[in-house]
């Protein structure tokens, strides 16, 4: 009686169960009544991740450097190539296929969570009592100085984009 | 959009000398550059190029006597112990692909 | 490193015909190959890239093909002014690691 289904990494074909090849292996010839599963290893640049009985192994995925990428985990003949965005740059997907440059805080707002490789910047208005002169992508609202703790006063009130002034204290003749 | 070489002169053996690539209508932030050289009655030949973030690649033939560096503007190829067989003409590149060439900078190595 | 070689060194051709120029590759490049047309005193021109894609500006008359190990540039319809020697450029890498750009030895083409 020919079998209708196939233990685990078996599979059916001419009313026969063959042995699947292992990931990192392409199948070259189906298994027959005599002869076992033939299969051969991926050649270099490409992989099959799994038990398989695919005849052409998958070309490793290119991290173009036109697009801002760069390799972030070799591939091998089971695993693909793995990308990821240059310094200073983040993917544009999940499939991180392109590369954006990271976002900076503008005057006035400051960073409040530094960008990965995956996501962008994120930036938050500085509160009362901070501010942020520059446009970074690292730098986070500073606190205003205290003139009290120097032992002077405030000639210039701080804003968000701004620190306050310090001066000295009128002296009573 | 273009880009435009300079630096090129005549130099005796062993002197350093400095290409910069100069990028018009396009910032060199968001590409590749590459540097490229072609010595007289030769054929074109790869120097290396340097990525968005500022990682160069080199030739295997380069072995650490050139370096490329770059700015928001510029790109420069460093060169040391230059001789006779470094005389070319040399050329910057925007992208791995060479969509846009300057007209080149010769250099001249001779005693 | 990976080797590109060109064939032939030179192809002669009459106005209206057809060229053909061959790059082969020592391991697979995929498609990352580009095609340049060079003039004396010029800075090369890229024609086609990522061994099909057609640059701006480049009539249609150039056609790129080929992947893997094995490339071709076709000229039709042959100007005069596609007198040149053309080049061949994998502008890829070789593996994750190593990136190179090697050219081919060039090919003259002489417009009878």
């Known amino acids: 009686e020919p079998p209708t289904a196939c233990r685990e990494k078996q599979y059916l074909i001419n009313s026969q169960c063959c042995s699947l090849c292992q990931p990192g292996q392409k199948l070259v010839s189906d298994c027959t009544e005599f002869t076992e599963t033939e299969c051969l290893p991926c050649g270099e640049s490409e992989f099959l991740d799994t038990w398989n009985r695919e005849t052409h192994c998958h070309q490793h995925k290119y991290c173009d450097p036109n697009l801002g990428l760069r390799v972030q985990q070799k591939g091998t003949s089971e695993t693909d190539t793995i990308c990821t965005c240059e310094e200073g740059w983040h993917c544009t997907s999940e499939a991180c296929e392109s590369c954006v440059l990271h976002r900076s805080c503008s005057p006035g707002f400051g960073v409040k969570q530094i960008a990965t490789g995956v996501s962008d910047t994120i930036c938050e208005p500085c509160p009362v009592g901070f501010f942020s002169n520059v446009s970074s992508a690292f730098e986070k609202c500073h606190p205003w100085t205290s003139c009290e703790t120097k032992d002077l006063v405030v000639q210039q009130a701080g804003t968000n984009k701004t620190d306050v002034v310090c001066g000295p204290q009128d002296r009573l003749r | 959009q273009s880009v435009e070489e300079s630096g090129g002169r005549l130099v005796t053996p062993g002197t350093p000398l400095t290409l910069t690539c100069t990028a018009s209508g396009f910032s060199l932030i968001g590409y590749v550059m590459g540097w490229f050289r072609q010595a007289p009655g030769k054929g074109l030949e790869y120097i290396g190029w340097i990525s968005f973030g500022g990682d160069p690649y080199y030739a295997s033939w380069v072995k650490g006597r050139f370096t490329i560096s770059k700015t928001s503007t510029t790109v420069d190829l460093k060169m040391t112990s230059l001789t006779t067989e470094d005389t070319a003409t040399y050329f910057c590149a925007r992208s791995t692909y060479g969509d846009i060439w300057g007209p080149g900078t010769l250099v001249t190595v001779s005693s | 490193d990976i080797v590109m070689t060109q064939t032939p060194a030179s192809v002669e051709a009459a106005v209206g015909g057809t060229v053909t120029i061959k790059c082969q590759a020592s391991?697979?490049?995929?498609?990352?190959l580009a095609w340049y047309q060079l003039k004396p005193g010029q800075p090369p021109k890229l024609l086609i890239y990522s061994a099909s894609t057609l640059a701006s500006g480049v009539p249609s008359r150039f056609k790129g093909s080929g992947s893997g190990t094995e490339f071709t540039l076709t000229i039709s319809d042959l100007e005069c002014a596609d007198a040149a020697t053309y080049y061949c450029q994998n502008h890829g890498y070789a593996t994750s690691e190593s990136y190179t750009n090697t050219f081919g030895g060039g090919t003259e083409v002489v417009v009878k």
């Open positions: 391991q697979s490049i995929s498609s990352r």
